[in-house]
């Protein structure tokens, strides 16, 4: 009771090899890496088949078919193009994930190559089959922002995309009656994060606690350039409001928090983060020159009594930016020391503006970004955070603004956005 | 429109406890500070504290830290003040408001032996 | 606490003449952040609970006639009636809720 000849299927083989089979002998299909056996329909690794008693085969010799590792997954702000023709996903075919550049470079530089495996998955060989991750690029404006700038009070207008991590933050506490409204800057870090002072979040309470103001009571403005005309930008409500522990509403240390977006928002030529700087608790040194933007008053004439008289209508409709020199420490301590009233410049600020006045931040621009441009890494880091000022006008002389000073509170801001500093390197000035 | 409508009249012995009742119509009742005044005969408006409903956040003023309590309940829209250990200075009428704007029509409470 | 003074503690004015109460706080109300004093004045009529008449120092509640104006920033505020009706006949009341609210001591306002 002899079986027909076997042929293996192509691409396959059939053990064990024998010239003749007879009732009983079993044969395992098998096929070539790469290639899955194919029966009705069904892939298998291997397939036995059986000589019968009547002299014919339990089963036909299924085939063997390539390998197809199937549509590549879509990566998060990222693009795939196929290294093969047809785009093709089967066995050995290559395909290559990128980034959406210039907003998002892939960790750890990684090459993005996948190949299609034996075992059916996209391979990559230092991820495996993980995919990449695209983080955003940060402190890289879209347009270059120019190296000479006169004079917020005493500013210029910044054209759009010039600052494309500041925000607009407003904050509508509707809770009073009437509703208590204010606003104030922050800076994106990531697609959901945002940095400003906590004294910006602080609630309006009746008492000295620190308590911040209820997440459904802040909305975030992105990509803002004209106040009158927010159709252009991205506006998203607050998942989390996150004030720093430490915060003390009298001096104003530790004057830092972060708000977590409920999306995180698409980035584009005018919507991109800041970098954070490095640990360093010396800060910005002396004598730098940092830009700061805000939508805050921007007229040194208005006085105090004008602005409550006519409510908002003292603000600037488009953004503003300004350069400062960082203001030696010792130099600032003194001159708000020679003050009467309890003024206290902490380590955790720094102090920046021009002995002889004229240019400042004021009301209206707390919490947005005081940003210097590392030669190093080539990007703008945030610095500082606009914190608070002297009693006189804006601009006054020898009334240096006072800036929470960022690199105080690296480790802090990261463990909020629950980021360990090693996966995000590429984001930090390097 | 906006309404608060307050409990009775109390009459209470030096030492005991008095809860007054504020309800509330005509807006969403959590999402507004409540407040508790007093003024005593005579005299002049004096704030004890207030509650925010949605949260049960509170705020009292020093002087009744520890002696005023106050709750809401968000199901019947109305908010509470408990004074405890009253003695004869606390007799007044004790009145709640919408934060700053709408008040209620004035619970007076007598304390007395 | 925040103390407020009211003055005069009583005034008579004529009707139809002009009738202004000053209130004093021991710190400024002036809030940096919303550009806010948070300073409310109110009414009350005997018998009556308080009404809003005037909050952030200067903005008029609806419904409250024109006549009543608020004025001041910092720590000197002013509620003017401009031309006292009979029934305008009260005692005012300012309010600080910059901090823990506390009430000025009242002014009573009756005619000459």
């Known amino acids: 009771n002899e079986c027909p000849e076997l042929q293996p299927p192509v691409h396959g083989k059939i053990e064990p090899s024998q010239a003749k089979y007879f009732f009983k002998d079993q044969v395992l299909v098998s096929c070539d890496t790469g290639y899955k056996v194919l029966k009705d329909n069904v892939e298998m690794d291997t397939f036995q088949i059986e000589c019968l008693k009547d002299g014919t085969w339990s089963n036909k010799i299924p085939t063997c078919k390539i390998v197809d590792c199937r549509a590549p997954g879509e990566l998060e702000h990222g693009l795939i193009t196929f290294s093969t023709r047809n785009n093709l996903t089967t066995y050995k075919s290559e395909i290559k994930y990128s980034c959406q550049e210039p907003y998002y470079k892939m960790l750890n530089n990684n090459t993005g190559i996948y190949t299609c495996s034996a075992q059916g998955v996209w391979m990559n060989k230092v991820l495996g089959r993980s995919l990449p991750t695209c983080l955003p690029e940060c402190g890289q404006p879209s347009r270059s922002l120019p190296s000479l700038v006169k004079r917020i009070i005493g500013g210029r207008n910044a054209e759009p995309g010039l600052f494309p991590w500041q925000a607009l933050i407003v904050v509508e506490d509707t809770s009073r009656v009437p509703n208590d409204k204010w606003f104030g800057s922050g800076a994106l870090l990531s697609a959901s994060w945002i940095l400003t002072a906590a004294h910006v979040l602080r609630s309006q309470r009746r008492d000295t606690t620190v308590i911040p103001v209820s997440k459904e009571h802040v909305t975030v403005y992105l990509g803002l350039h004209d106040v009158r005309d927010k159709s252009g930008a991205v506006n998203s409500s607050a998942a989390r409001v996150v004030l720093h522990p430490d915060f003390n509403i009298q001096n104003y240390n530790h004057d830092i928090a972060l708000v977590q977006l409920q999306e995180p928002v698409p980035l584009g030529p005018h919507v991109m983060p800041v970098c954070l700087p490095r640990l360093e608790p010396e800060g910005p040194a002396p004598h730098m020159l940092g830009l700061v933007a805000g939508w805050g008053i921007s007229n040194p004439n208005v006085t105090v009594d004008e602005i409550i008289s006519s409510g908002t209508r003292t603000l600037s409709d488009v953004l503003q930016y300004v350069k400062l020199p960082v203001v030696p420490h010792a130099e600032c301590k003194t001159s708000y020391e020679s003050r009467s009233g309890n003024y206290s410049v902490t380590e955790n600020m720094f102090c920046a503006g021009y002995y002889e006045g004229g240019k400042d931040t004021c009301l209206g621009d707390s919490g947005g970004a005081f940003v210097i441009f590392d030669d190093l890494s080539q990007r703008w880091v945030v610095q500082g955070l606009v914190s608070w000022g002297g009693p006189e006008e804006c601009g006054s002389k020898q009334v240096y603004g006072v800036y929470t000073k960022v690199s105080n509170y690296v480790d802090w801001v990261w463990e909020q956005m629950g980021l360990p500093q090693s996966v995000v390197e590429p984001q930090v000035e390097r | 429109q906006v309404q608060l409508v307050q409990s009775g009249a109390e009459v209470k012995k030096p030492g005991a406890s008095v809860k007054v009742s504020c309800k509330a119509s005509?807006?969403?009742?959590?999402?507004?500070?409540i407040e508790w005044v007093r003024q005593a005969p005579g005299q002049g408006l004096e704030w004890i504290g207030e509650i925010l409903p949605g949260t049960g956040s509170t705020n009292y003023a020093q002087k009744f830290q520890g002696r005023a309590t106050f709750t809401a309940d968000s199901s019947t829209s109305t908010a509470y003040m408990e004074l405890s250990s009253l003695r004869s200075e606390d007799t007044a009428v004790y009145y709640c408001?919408?934060?700053?704007?709408?008040w209620g029509q004035g619970t007076l409470v007598t304390v007395s032996s | 606490d925040i103390v407020m003074t009211q003055s005069p503690d009583s005034l008579a004015v004529s009707l139809g003449e002009r009738a202004t109460i000053n209130c004093k706080s021991s710190?400024?109300?002036?809030?940096?952040?919303?550009?806010?004093?948070?300073l409310a004045w109110y009414q009350q009529k005997p018998g009556q609970p308080p009404k809003l008449l005037i909050y952030w120092a200067s903005t008029r509640e609806s419904g409250v006639p024109d006549r009543f104006s608020g004025s001041g920033s910092g720590t000197d505020f002013t509620l003017t009636i401009s031309s006292l009706q009979a029934e305008d006949v009260a005692v005012y009341y300012c309010?600080?809720?910059?901090?823990?609210?506390?009430f000025g001591q009242g002014t009573k306002v009756e005619i000459k």
């Open positions: 408001l919408r934060s700053e704007d709408v």
């Open positions: 309010k600080q809720s910059y901090n823990i609210p506390t």
């Open positions: 005509g807006y969403t009742f959590t999402g507004k500070w």
């Open positions: 710190q400024s109300l002036l809030a940096s952040r919303t550009r806010k004093n948070y």
